[in-house]
């Protein structure tokens, strides 16, 4: 499929001008190659009319130009003084005409309306309102006022001052007679339909002295705005329908066959299943405008989209609308990354998030898509050291591996973590990607204790058991804080026997904290990685308590019946206000959350020396300050 994209249909009137924009992937080759506009012949050839290399056909001399905008990946063909002879099938393209790097455009130039003298022309958008003004003389002030529409040869009454309304206009038309001072009546038609277009006649009085005024109503179907986005990327449709529909239900629909327009999302809570997890309808402004963000663009998302306002939340005749033609470029700059990541309950996932590598300094974000209302995406973590309170100790955003990818690790998974998550930055809004996390049955691969309590001034050793499947991976322990997970020294204690059918390649790796202090309290992760690519992690919360006075009973003794694998997680989570992605501009403008970065530092860890009586009287304590 050609990656070149432009308008499928262009309509104009004799004597007018058109401006045709064609899009191409802005690779360095494409930016500098020849651009052309050619007319397709009956036998399949395509005759160049104008090109970026300076050629202009005699047919276009003095009335056309072609301008390349390499930074945008677009070129524009302007044609003036149109005649009906210009109607036909054209191509805009790159390279040589026959190569197929092109897009087909149909240009239709119609004859201007043959208007009667003294005809007032009203040009109004579909779904909007028109007011037709009808002047009259004093002698007709008390006489019947009426508006007719010319259907074929015959005028058909639309409305009159005696109360008649044509059934085609019921509920959307009124006749206003101005105060006595003004010799004018007006007819207001709302929710204009394409079928309302045509010649109208307004009349005051019915005899030979009646006053008459001709009006020509042109109802414009909105020209679709062309939108060219990359596969796997994101698109935002900004819909501004005007304050008069501020309180009417809004919708975005996608045109299917014929005139059908299938609702993608609306403010009444409807959402098409194909867009689950990857769409947000952002709240309306006071003027009734709103926007819809779609991420994780697929080939099949290409097509014509309409936004509109109607009490039913879907397209009806007379809905004011805006239109877009979306082209999804399959030669995407956004790299492939898994759209579904599976994790075992109790274990972890590591999600790779792409971003525009030109924006390495941008702030990275990860949010959880929620389908309630019109969809929202409350922020969970960012690269500035903010982590939503409920996720402390189990969520980390790492800048690694860098160069266009960051990593998000979420551990201690439960079924409640299943859902759709968005990767995004405060930079290029096109680089928003979606990943679905699915929770599956199974056992975590890494085995760690449940709740761990250290004693002030003593040494703590926490084991992490790695199965053979991770024999080629780097194994690590780190201390979690809101800016990441700081690596700690750890010791390989040899093979682990924690796994059935696992040979000497399984490992037991210990974290050792010597001379424990209060600063050592917190979440510790053990995990595996290969270079800068992270694998599974397991989390342990280390509480720190005072050393007990001699003879006092150790509370841990009372836990004699606890299951050996039981995980007791800290449930003292603080509730804080959601930070939600509701407006795609949010990140460019503000980040209204206090920086809760953990300033505590001073965790001590050591590699165990392995002496048989290290803690039994010897003074060999190793301190590692971070």
């Amino acid at each position: 499929k050609s990656p070149i994209f432009g308008p499928e249909e262009v309509n104009s009137v004799e004597g007018n001008s058109v401006s045709i924009t064609c899009y191409y992937p802005p690779t360095s080759v494409n930016r500098h190659t020849r651009k052309y506009w050619c007319r397709q012949g009956a036998r399949g050839g395509c005759i160049t009319l104008i090109s970026s290399e300076g050629y202009v056909s005699s047919k276009y001399a003095g009335r056309a130009n072609l301008t390349n905008f390499p930074e945008n990946g677009t070129f524009v063909v302007n044609i003036a003084q149109l005649s009906q002879d210009d109607s036909g099938r054209y191509k805009c393209g790159l390279g040589i005409n026959s190569r197929g790097l092109s897009f087909d455009v149909s240009l239709e130039v119609s004859q201007g309306p043959g208007l009667l003298n003294d005809t007032k022309v009203y040009t109004v958008d579909l779904g909007r309102t028109v007011t037709i003004n009808c002047p009259f003389k004093t002698e007709n002030a008390q006489k019947r006022k009426s508006l007719y529409k010319q259907i074929g040869l015959y005028p058909v009454l639309v409305i009159d001052s005696s109360g008649y309304v044509n059934p085609n206009y019921t509920g959307r038309i009124r006749l206003d007679i101005q105060g006595t001072g003004q010799l004018l009546f007006s007819v207001v038609i709302n929710q204009l339909r394409l079928s309302d277009a045509g010649q109208y006649l307004c009349q005051a009085g019915d005899d030979s002295n009646s006053n008459k005024k001709n009006a020509d109503l042109q109802v414009l179907k909105p020209e679709p705005e062309l939108v060219y986005e990359d596969l796997r990327g994101s698109v935002t449709f900004h819909c501004a329908l005007g304050p008069e529909v501020a309180n009417v239900a809004k919708f975005l629909c996608r045109q299917s066959s014929g005139e059908n327009c299938d609702v993608v999302v609306n403010t009444l809570g409807k959402r098409a299943p194909a867009f689950e997890g990857r769409i947000l309808l952002n709240p309306q402004d006071k003027d009734g405008s709103f926007s819809v963000v779609i991420t994780g663009l697929r080939k099949e998302d290409a097509g014509r989209y309409l936004c509109g306002a109607h009490s039913d939340g879907q397209l009806q005749e007379g809905s004011p609308i805006q239109a877009w033609q979306l082209f999804v470029n399959e030669e995407s700059t956004i790299p492939r990354s898994p759209t579904v990541v599976k994790g075992v309950a109790g274990s972890s996932v590591a999600v790779l998030c792409p971003y525009n590598r030109k924006e390495s300094k941008s702030i990275k974000y990860w949010c959880l898509w929620e389908g309630a209302q019109n969809g929202r995406c409350p922020l969970l973590v960012d690269s500035e050291g903010w982590v939503k309170a409920q996720y402390e100790g189990r969520l980390s955003l790492l800048e690694e591996p860098g160069n266009g990818t960051f990593t998000v690790i979420l551990n201690q998974l439960t079924s409640r973590d299943a859902g759709f998550y968005w990767c995004l930055t405060n930079g290029d809004t096109l680089w928003r990607t979606t990943v679905e996390i699915k929770i599956i049955e199974g056992e975590p691969n890494l085995k760690v204790p449940g709740n761990v309590t250290a004693v002030l001034g003593e040494t703590l050793k926490v084991p992490c058991h790695f199965p053979c499947k991770f024999s080629s991976y780097e194994k690590y322990w780190c201390k979690w804080n809101n800016t990441g997970c700081q690596a700690l020294p750890s010791q390989d204690e040899g093979p682990s026997k924690a796994f059935v059918n696992c040979d000497e390649n399984s490992r037991l790796v210990s974290l050792t904290l010597n001379l424990v202090t209060r600063a050592d309290e917190g979440w510790y992760w053990c995990g595996v990685k290969q270079g800068h690519f992270y694998g599974e992690t397991a989390a342990v919360y280390v509480a720190v308590e005072e050393r007990k006075a001699a003879g006092s009973r150790d509370v841990s003794l009372a836990k004699a019946d606890a299951a050996p694998d039981e995980k007791v997680l800290d449930s003292g989570f603080r509730e804080i206000e959601n930070k939600a992605i509701q407006d795609p501009r949010l990140f460019a403008e503000e980040k209204a959350v206090a920086d809760t970065r953990d300033q505590a530092d001073g965790s001590r860890a050591s590699v165990d020396s392995g002496s048989s009586e290290e803690q039994g009287g010897s003074s060999r304590h190793h301190h590692h300050h971070h």
């Epitope: 761990v452 003593e458 703590l460 026997k497 924690a498 037991l508 210990s510 841990s556 004699a560 392995g610």
Partner: nanobody, 125 residues
């Protein structure tokens, strides 16, 4: 469930030696995933910590009252932990308990989660 069974207790003279063993079975995880410890309880007194050992035997910790006289070791191949007691004193008379934990910490507050039934050691003067 983890079952811990102690053996080796008995009656000895002051100054003698004795070796206690603890065998683990029915584990949810293998033996070398547990730190192990010995505790004791003398008649009319609270249970007290004696010694502990990390999951691979790399580190140990002893109560001051037994330091230099008792040695704790483990054999992960046989799923056993041993307490070698030398220079026994009448004050060492107690029921000795074996315990396991999912992690190890130095000090007398061993985080035990499973216990054996105990074996009686009597030291006569």
């Amino acid at each position: 469930q983890v079952q811990l069974v102690e053996s080796g207790g008995g009656l000895v003279q002051a100054g003698d030696s004795l070796r206690l063993s603890c065998a683990a079975s029915g584990r949810a995880l293998s033996f070398n995933t547990y730190a192990m410890a010995w505790f004791r309880q003398a008649p009319g007194k609270e249970r007290e910590f004696v010694a502990s050992i990390t999951y691979n035997g790399g580190s140990t910790y002893y109560a001051d009252s037994v330091k230099g006289r008792f040695t704790v070791t483990r054999d992960n191949g046989k799923d056993t932990v041993t307490l070698r007691m030398n220079s026994l004193k009448p004050d060492d008379t107690a029921v000795y308990y074996c315990a396991s934990a999912q992690y190890w910490r130095s000090g007398t507050s061993f985080p035990a989660n499973y216990w054996g039934q105990g074996t009686l050691v009597t030291v006569s003067s």
